[in-house]
Interface confidence: low
């Protein structure tokens, strides 16, 4: 905390308009406390939450908020279905603005935003939208929180039946029901750019009182993808006057902001008022301290399917403040190469950044399917031996993944390594979110719009006259799911391996919760058909005796192409592009940026938000992903992996699941669950095409030369 | 009325520590966040640092090692160390007020510096 | 670093009405406050957070504020008025704090 002057965060953004005098006609609600004498209350101090009630009665009452939420002891209400969204896709008027209020910053709301279901009592309107942070670097900041796990930044919507109200304040002031959402926001590597208008104005109301209208945004784009899986109960204000009329709405999923954007929050400034005069200081733990549940039953969502991969991917390994902690950056440098027909090699190197040092070993895993089966092996690698590992009695018939996992001291954990598929005979090529087998041309009117081309200058090697093929996959799992030691054949997905369609002694499918944890979205695939990964020997035929070696020439291709890549947030929430912002644009290659312009421009056959991941359908178990829950059920269970002990060789049996998977919806902004389409005639891939890699996530840096194609991806 | 003083200006030596005390009559240091500001002579004003009713303090990055402001419910005193020709100056205590200003301001005492 | 600018010097006729400017990249986040000092004597708070006048202030000075300027008008400028005005704001991150004056504007009234 701090008090002070007339000094304040200095922020270098471009000019943000302030409000005019003769403009602020809306500003009522939030100036009605110095108009009509309201209590002064604050978030510490002789003002504090524990003395609201002296100034403010229903402050002590027995159902107020904020609660934590305990999944668990929740129930499913099936009167808690869908939420019904009007006006949340448009963008908002320039007469929308934001105002510090010196407790929180809030946005006025000037358009038409409506929400009904959710077993509200009517059609709410949108008033305004509140946050609350913490103090720093990610602390908790959240009001409300979920088995104990509290977000950084909370961002509240309230809603008042305009039906009934004139006006959201006249609500409050009789003592009638008001609607409220909760929506976490969660440390991610990447700006979100949908919240790119709400950081500006931050940057504009950085001292108490100031206003500031907002550059458009898409009030949709603040809330998560999957809105199907959220919380009800019936609470509070968690401000005075606390009236116990909030309905309350909290997601379940969160929503990514990065470090540079939280930096914003942390910069706004109050007033504080001590005795009879007030001192400036940063407005920071802006949250009420959480309040007894008493009486209360808090209700879970029975949108169908909404909680499938709830549990696994979100509670156990949380994305909250205090979630698993990761050592170190992957290990980097993913390679396999053959020693023989029967034995390969892995090679990595350390990873770049070693948070807590120091690495003890390496933990490699890796999976392999035959005969309907998946078998799983982990085992051990010091660290101050050649970072390799050879797999002996390899079948050329089955389909094996690797990844590796620095280990630290008390069990700390790296993320883990980029997922490499290897299989010989067959190429499978990982995009978006299918699998691909190379060279079988089949007709789909829209999956050029998923798939890119590969280039004919891909190259098959072979060894012992066994041809092999490989592919690197985006897994890239963060912190979020590093710390659950999750086997490699829990981690590929269903749809990964439905998408190859193998027969006879392949694999169907594999189970929903099976790797990779996060596939490239949408937004990604649309960048990737402007880098078609161009698959060379060299990359990996020789990786040479130095697994340490710098990349190869390939390698530092792709690593500077990668920069395009919006890559998804830890909290797997969402791939976020910033196209005409991102400054690391100036540093791509001309072919990459050609291509990106090809992407820009290109027809779309089937258009998706850039927000939105090509893997929001509700079915499909990609732990961390923002998943939309329209789609239609199938018959996945929600399997979750077993834990590792890396220390151990294990071997565990995952069986199969067959899976369909369908298009259903029709909404381009949001498309559903991805289809298992075939390839259309117009996705030609060579013959030969042996070995691609495709990007990696957001801190792999590996990879394979990036350049430009005809094709395009939305 | 309320109005401030500075104590403890005087001429010194370089590399010279020397401490600047500051009293306030007609209200309580204790509420307010108190700033020290400097002027060389014939130049403009230039914040030092600020330090918050809760004791935490904020300086300019020049000031930052040298200089440290700090705190009874009586006085606010600021240490410099090391000082150089350069610090000569007219040192004010300022009370912080209306949210966003320096609304009150000592007479000012002057520190010279000089071998 | 952060800099507010201000001009070195200003004239205005007794009587006149003058205007002081103050600029600077990004103040239009942050409030501006404006200080009159008196040779030989401590600086005294005209304007704070762009346009409040603390008690005492006589309401020929007055504050605005548009887009990155920060602006001090005195009307019916008095001989009584010739002095150094400084504005300040601030520069800074959530980790950094710093106070910013401006150079100041010296104010002659002639005539």
């Known amino acids: 905390v701090l008090h002070y002057v007339v000094c304040f965060p200095a922020l270098t953004e471009g000019y943000v308009g302030t409000l005019q005098e003769s403009r602020q006609d809306s500003s009522v609600q939030i100036r009605r406390r110095k108009a009509s004498g309201d209590p002064y209350w604050a978030y510490s101090g002789a003002y504090g939450p524990e003395h609201w009630v002296t100034s403010s009665v229903s402050c002590g009452g027995s159902h107020q908020s904020p609660i934590d939420i305990l999944d668990h002891h929740a129930r499913v209400g099936d009167e808690y279905q869908e939420l019904q969204l009007d006006g949340f896709d448009n963008e908002s008027s320039n007469k929308t603005w934001m105002k510090n209020t010196g407790k929180t910053v809030a946005i006025l709301l000037k358009d038409d935003y409506f929400v009904s279901g959710a077993g509200l009592p009517g059609r709410f309107k949108a008033e305004k939208v509140e946050f609350h942070w913490g103090h720093s670097n990610g602390s908790a900041g959240s009001e409300h929180s979920v088995n104990g796990r509290r977000f950084p930044v909370e961002m509240q919507i309230f809603f008042y039946n305009p039906d009934d109200f004139d006006s959201f304040q006249t609500a409050i002031s009789e003592n009638r029901i008001i609607g409220a959402m909760a929506i976490f926001f969660q440390v991610s590597p990447r700006d979100n750019s949908a919240l790119d208008p709400i950081i500006h104005g931050l940057k504009g109301v950085v001292h108490h009182e100031k206003e500031t209208f907002l550059d458009p945004f898409i009030l949709r784009d603040l809330l998560p993808a999957s809105l199907g899986s959220y919380y009800r109960y019936t609470g509070s204000l968690t401000t005075p006057p606390c009236s116990e009329i909030v309905e309350w709405i909290v997601f379940r999923r969160p929503v990514p902001i990065s470090y540079h954007q939280l930096e914003a929050f942390y910069s706004i400034f109050t007033t504080e008022q001590q005795d009879h005069v007030k001192s400036v200081e940063y407005l920071r733990n802006n949250f009420r301290p959480q309040q007894a549940l008493n009486d209360r039953v808090v209700s879970k969502s029975a949108v169908r399917d909404a909680w499938n991969h709830d549990l696994a991917d979100f509670l156990d390994n949380p994305l909250g403040t205090e979630a698993s902690k990761v050592c170190s950056s992957p290990p980097i440098h993913m390679k396999v190469q053959p020693l023989n027909q029967t034995a390969l090699q892995v090679s990595w190197s350390q990873p770049e950044t070693i948070y807590h040092p120091p690495i003890m070993n390496y933990m490699i895993s890796y999976s392999w399917t035959k005969n309907e089966d998946e078998k799983e092996k982990t085992f051990t690698k010091d660290s101050d031996k050649d970072l390799k590992a050879t797999i002996s009695h390899v079948s050329p018939d089955s389909l094996y993944l690797f990844r590796v996992q620095a280990v630290c001291r008390n069990d700390m954990r790296s993320d883990f390594s980029q997922t490499m598929l290897f299989q010989a005979n067959t190429t499978r090529i990982f995009q978006g979110t299918r699998i691909v087998k190379t060279g079988v041309p089949t007709a789909s009117p829209a999956s050029s719009a998923d798939m890119a081309p590969i280039s004919s200058g891909s190259s098959t090697w072979t060894s012992s006259g066994i041809p092999f093929s490989f592919v690197s996959m985006a897994t890239g799992m963060g912190p979020s799911s590093s710390g659950s030691q999750a086997t490699v054949a829990s981690v590929v997905t269903s749809t990964l391996l439905a998408g190859l369609g193998f027969g006879g002694g392949g694999i169907s499918s594999f189970p929903s919760t099976v790797w990779p944890t996060r596939l490239p979205t949408a937004s990604a695939a649309s960048k990737q058909a402007g880098r078609t990964v161009l698959a060379t020997t060299e990359a990996l035929a020789s990786p040479g005796p130095d697994v340490h070696s710098a990349p190869s020439k390939d390698s530092e291709g792709t690593e500077e192409g990668e920069k395009e890549e919006k890559s998804e947030s830890e909290d797997g929430e969402r791939e976020h592009e910033e196209e005409e912002k991102d400054s690391e644009k100036k540093e791509k290659s001309e072919a990459t940026h050609t291509a990106a312009e090809s992407d820009r421009t290109a027809p779309a056959p089937t258009p998706s938000s850039p927000h939105r991941t090509a893997a929001e359908g509700g079915h499909q178990t990609i732990p961390g992903r923002r998943q939309d829950h329209s789609a239609p059920a199938t018959d996945q269970p929600g399997h979750v992996a077993p834990d590792l002990d890396p220390l151990v060789d294990t071997a565990t049996q995952v069986p199969p699941t067959a899976t369909e998977e369908h298009y259903s919806g029709s909404d381009p902004r949001r498309p559903e669950m991805p289809s298992k389409k075939p390839m259309s005639r117009g996705d030609r891939f060579s013959e030969d095409s042996k070995f691609i890699t495709v990007n990696p996530a957001e801190k792999n840096t590996s990879g394979m030369l990036s350049r430009p194609s005809p094709g395009r991806m939305e | 009325a309320q109005s401030l003083e500075e104590f403890g200006g005087r001429l010194a030596t370089p590399g010279t520590p020397l401490t600047l005390t500051c009293t306030a009559s007609?209200?309580?240091?204790?509420?307010?966040?108190m700033s020290w500001v400097r002027q060389a002579p014939g130049k403009g004003l230039e914040w030092i640092g600020t330090?918050?009713?809760?004791?935490d303090a904020y300086y300019a990055s020049w000031a930052k090692g040298r200089f440290t402001i700090s705190r009874t419910s009586t006085t606010v005193d600021l240490k410099m160390t090391s000082l150089a020709t350069e610090d000569t100056a007219t040192y004010f205590c300022?009370?912080?007020?209306?949210?966003?200003?320096?609304?009150?301001w000592g007479p000012g005492t002057l520190v010279t510096i000089s071998s | 670093s952060f800099v507010l600018t201000q001009p070195a010097s200003v004239q205005v006729n007794l009587g006149q009405t003058v205007s002081l400017t103050c600029t600077a990249d990004t103040l239009s986040r942050r409030y501006a406050s404006w200080y009159q000092q008196k040779p030989g004597q401590a600086p005294v708070l005209l304007i704070y957070r762009d346009t409040s006048r603390p008690s005492g202030v006589p309401d020929r000075f007055s504050g605005s504020s548009s887009g990155n300027t920060a602006t001090l008008t005195i009307s019916g400028a008095q001989a009584g008025d010739e002095a150094d005005y400084y504005c300040?704001?601030?520069?800074?991150?959530?980790?950094?704090?710093?106070?910013?004056f401006g150079g100041g504007t010296q104010l002659t009234v002639t005539g």
């Open positions: 007609g209200f309580s240091l204790g509420t307010y966040s």
């Open positions: 330090i918050g009713g809760r004791g």
């Open positions: 300040a704001t601030s520069d800074g991150s959530g980790s950094s704090y710093q106070c910013v």
């Open positions: 300022v009370r912080e007020n209306y949210g966003y200003a320096f609304d009150i």
